[in-house]
């Protein structure tokens, strides 16, 4: 947030930008974590908006027996490779058709041994707090389906009657990589030295990185008529003074009527 400054006091303000704020000629430009005229206030919520989708990549190897390996298959721009890629992609699209998270396959390498196909199976799901479970389940179904097809679609009498045939023993899952998204970790990192006081709370399955100074959450600190302010020692209530009352206490819940105090003092005089 920024506050524009007009008049003679502006130069003084320029040299007083705090917490890494920079003067742009009119106002203090504050870093993400701060706001206020001098960047003196700590924000109460940090945007850690999750990605819309989370991806996973499975590195698989299958052995295709219905195609004989030729040197041209090593060249990804050759007609041979392009045709193989088309057939293999169509075959895998059929194999994985029941998996909503399935996006496609990407061949990384073809090598000798009938045709050994090193490839990635790409998965994607909408972000929810349960995305890990969703993708873990999808990877298990991928394993089941590829194992099944490579067991069933095999050469008989040296001829394949399917779109592609496989060597049952040539199917291997080398590695599974899931895009890591850890809102708690992101929240802690972005809150920097205030990280101990910021927490992640979910609303409509969306994570919010908030301090107790952000109203409307279960961890929110109720300062009553006071103002919640974050400091390095945690959130604190800054209590206000009205025309009639002083407020005090940890949550500014103790009100003292000024007239009673003044009356008491006059009594002593």
């Amino acid at each position: 947030r920024t506050t524009t400054c007009f008049g003679d006091g502006c130069q003084n303000t320029a040299s007083r930008c705090k917490n890494g704020g920079t003067w742009d000629g009119l106002k203090c430009q504050c870093p993400n974590l701060y706001y206020g005229e001098l960047c003196e206030e700590v924000v109460s919520s940090i945007d850690i908006g999750p990605p819309e989708t989370i991806s996973a990549q499975m590195e698989l190897t299958v052995t295709v027996t219905s195609v004989k390996f030729t040197e041209e298959l090593k060249n990804h721009s050759s007609q041979e490779f392009q045709e193989f890629k088309q057939t293999f992609t169509e075959q895998m699209n059929i194999v994985y058709s029941g998996i909503p998270e399935y996006v496609g396959v990407n061949i990384t390498k073809l090598r000798l041994g009938s045709v050994v196909v090193e490839h990635d199976v790409l998965l994607r799901t909408k972000y929810t707090p349960e995305y890990k479970t969703v993708l873990d389940n999808a990877t298990e179904v991928v394993k089941e389906k590829i194992t099944k097809v490579t067991t069933q679609q095999i050469m008989i009498n040296d001829i394949c009657s399917d779109m592609m045939c496989f060597n049952t023993t040539g199917t291997q899952v080398q590695n599974i990589t899931v895009t890591q998204y850890d809102p708690e970790e992101d929240c802690r990192k972005m809150a920097k030295e205030y990280g101990d006081y910021f927490v992640v709370e979910y609303r409509d399955q969306k994570p919010y990185c908030i301090s107790p100074c952000e109203p409307g959450f279960s961890v929110s600190k109720n300062c009553n008529l006071g103002k919640c302010q974050m400091s390095l020692s945690g959130p604190q209530c800054l209590c206000v003074t009205t025309e009639t009352h002083w407020y005090s206490g940890e949550t500014c819940n103790q009100g003292t009527q000024k007239s009673l105090v003044y009356g008491h003092h006059h009594h002593h005089h």
Epitope: K68, E72, S78, C160, D162, M163
Partner: nanobody, 123 residues
Framework: DVQLQASGGGLVQPGGSLRLSCAAS????????MSWFRQAPGKEREGVAI???????GYADSVKGRFTISQDNAKNSLYLQMNSLRAEDTAVYYC?????????????????WGQGTMVTVSS
């Protein structure tokens, strides 16, 4: 684009012979594979025979010993010699080609197709 054109079909009596030809527009498939498929009325297209650039040939069980596939790379041509023809051989015959050295007689494995030629076996 690669062009394939099948010819040589016709009416033949049971037990008779016929030779089908398939002309390719160039020799693109001389290092890959070529094949014959057929489709009888109301039925799915099925593989008949396949020949690869390494000299390998394969046949559907229903035609083994009766049909012979061959090719002439100099003429960019594929042939199917059909002997001892039966009524159940009646179908439209298609030639197909691939850049790959294939061992598959499933139409989904083949990307390049020619126009069909009709073979009718009837007395």
């Amino acid at each position: 684009d690669v062009q394939l054109q099948a010819s040589g079909g016709g009416l033949v009596q049971p037990g008779g012979s016929l030779r089908l030809s398939c002309a390719a527009s160039d020799n693109t498939f001389s290092r890959g594979s070529m094949s014959w498929f057929r489709q009888a009325p109301g039925k799915e297209r099925e593989g008949v025979a396949i020949i690869s650039s390494d000299g390998w040939t394969g046949y559907a069980d229903s035609v083994k010993g009766r049909f012979t596939i061959s090719q002439d790379n100099a003429k960019n041509s594929l042939y199917l010699q059909m002997n001892s023809l039966r009524a159940e051989d009646t179908a439209v015959y298609y030639c197909a080609a691939s850049f790959l050295v294939l061992r598959a007689l499933n139409p989904k494995a083949w990307h390049y197709w020619g126009q069909g030629t009709m073979v009718t076996v009837s007395s």
